[in-house]
């Protein structure tokens, strides 16, 4: 018969035959033949191959350095890579979360959108018209402004984006 | 027939080095992996690691790193184990084994000892 | 590492008794990477069992394996006076490849 040119998924050719891939979390030691299958060995305590493969090495896990400001999110098995996340306060510096920079604050004037995660920055938004924020926080939204109507009180002092409105007692009527 | 001729019995001074021999007949020596484990009698079977005959590539187990060396020579069908710095905890008997992609370690040399002593 | 851990150490059995060995591994192995060697004295191991339960060629019937996860065990339905020998359990789980300490099944 006519060597193959192509194989099936989860196989690959050499030598003119097509051998099976070493499954995920083995890696390669002899490929097959016509009387023998190929041969796989198991990837080290802190290795790892995630496809189906004919790899002559393992991957090494990724190492979440704490002097990065990196932990763990979840352990690397023989079959997937370590996930790591950032310390608390802290986000990653990009998608493959290899350093970890501070949370941004939000200015005054700005409240928090949305809390930072470990995978991403704080998101700030300008305090609108009735709202104000007079802190820099990385977890404070914009606060409305007091209702002097619902105290009794008037405006004395209006608001602004940083500054909560100051209330005070009504001017009486002079008889 | 399968078979995986060892070397014979070594006697050798502390600090020294050795290499051990395993030549396999009977079928096609690149098709398998050479594997090698020690027997002792304080830690029963140790793997000490594998090397790919076709690739030429070892993977050793962490604690033989530094100790143990695998080679081989296609031409000869032989594969070797090399031990450094010895000393009275490398006396053992050593064995090749290959496995089949089916099985385990199908076939066994008849294992070399070694004695470390001054 | 899997640290596969036998037990007994040594046994001794009459012909015609039924006997059982365990071995239990540190974490958790397919049933197809675990496997069983005898050894007799001066000779080198011999494959007895793989992936768990099944015979390797020529190996009797009186033997059986079993088992999944961390407990397998080897079972030799009754005891012939050339089954004295030792018996260790093997995974091919996870690198480095690991063997039990052994068990010494001894003739009375």
């Known amino acids: 018969p006519e060597p193959p040119t192509a194989c099936r998924e989860k196989q690959y050719l050499i030598n003119s035959q097509c051998c099976s891939l070493c499954q995920p979390g083995q890696k390669l030691v002899s490929d097959c033949t016509e009387f023998t299958e190929t041969e796989c060995l198991p990837c080290g305590e802190s290795e790892f191959l995630d496809t189906w493969n004919r790899e002559t090495h393992c991957h090494q896990h990724k190492y979440c350095d704490p002097n990065l400001g990196l932990r763990v999110q979840q352990k690397g098995t023989s079959e997937t890579d370590t996930i790591c996340t950032c310390e608390e306060g802290w986000h990653c510096t990009s998608e493959a979360c290899e350093s970890c920079v501070l949370h941004r604050s939000c200015s005054p004037g700005f409240g928090v959108k949305q809390i930072a995660t470990g995978v991403s920055d704080t998101i700030c938004e300008p305090c609108p018209v009735g709202f104000f924020s007079n802190v820099s926080s990385a977890f404070e939204k914009c606060h409305p402004w007091t209702s002097c109507e619902t105290k009794d009180l008037v405006v004395q002092q209006a608001g602004t984006n940083k500054t909560d409105v100051v209330c005070g007692p009504q001017d009486r009527l002079r008889a | 027939e399968v078979q995986l001729q060892q070397s014979g019995a070594e006697l050798v001074s502390p600090g020294v080095s050795v290499k051990i021999s395993c030549k396999g007949s009977?079928?096609?020596?690149?098709?398998?992996?050479m594997h090698w484990v020690k027997q002792s009698h304080a830690k029963s079977l140790e793997w000490i690691g594998v090397?790919?005959?076709?690739?030429?590539?070892?993977t050793y187990n962490q604690k033989f790193k530094g100790k143990a060396t695998l080679s081989v020579d296609k031409s000869s069908s032989t594969a070797y184990l090399e031990l450094a710095r010895l000393t009275s905890e490398d006396s053992a008997i050593y064995y090749c084994?290959?496995?089949?992609?089916?099985?385990?370690?199908?076939?066994w040399g008849q294992g070399t000892t070694l004695t470390v002593s001054s | 590492q899997i640290v596969l851990t036998q037990s007994p150490a040594i046994m001794s059995a009459s012909p015609g008794e039924k006997i059982t060995i365990t071995c239990s591994a540190s974490?958790?192995?397919?049933?197809?990477?675990l496997h069983w060697y005898q050894q007799k004295p001066g000779f080198s191991p011999k494959l007895l069992i793989y992936?768990?339960?099944n015979l390797a060629s020529g190996v009797p019937a009186r033997f059986s394996g079993s088992g999944s996860g961390t407990s397998y065990s080897l079972t030799i339905s009754s005891m012939e006076a050339e089954d004295a020998a030792t018996y260790y359990c093997?995974?091919?789980?996870?690198?480095?490849?690991?063997f039990g300490a052994g068990t010494k099944l001894e003739l009375k």
């Open positions: 084994a290959r496995r089949d992609s089916k099985s385990p370690f199908d076939y």
């Open positions: 009977g079928y096609t020596f690149t098709d398998h992996g």
């Open positions: 090397i790919s005959t076709s690739y030429g590539v070892a």
């Open positions: 974490s958790s192995i397919s049933s197809n990477y």
């Open positions: 992936r768990t339960s």
């Open positions: 093997h995974q091919y789980h996870r690198s480095p490849l690991t």
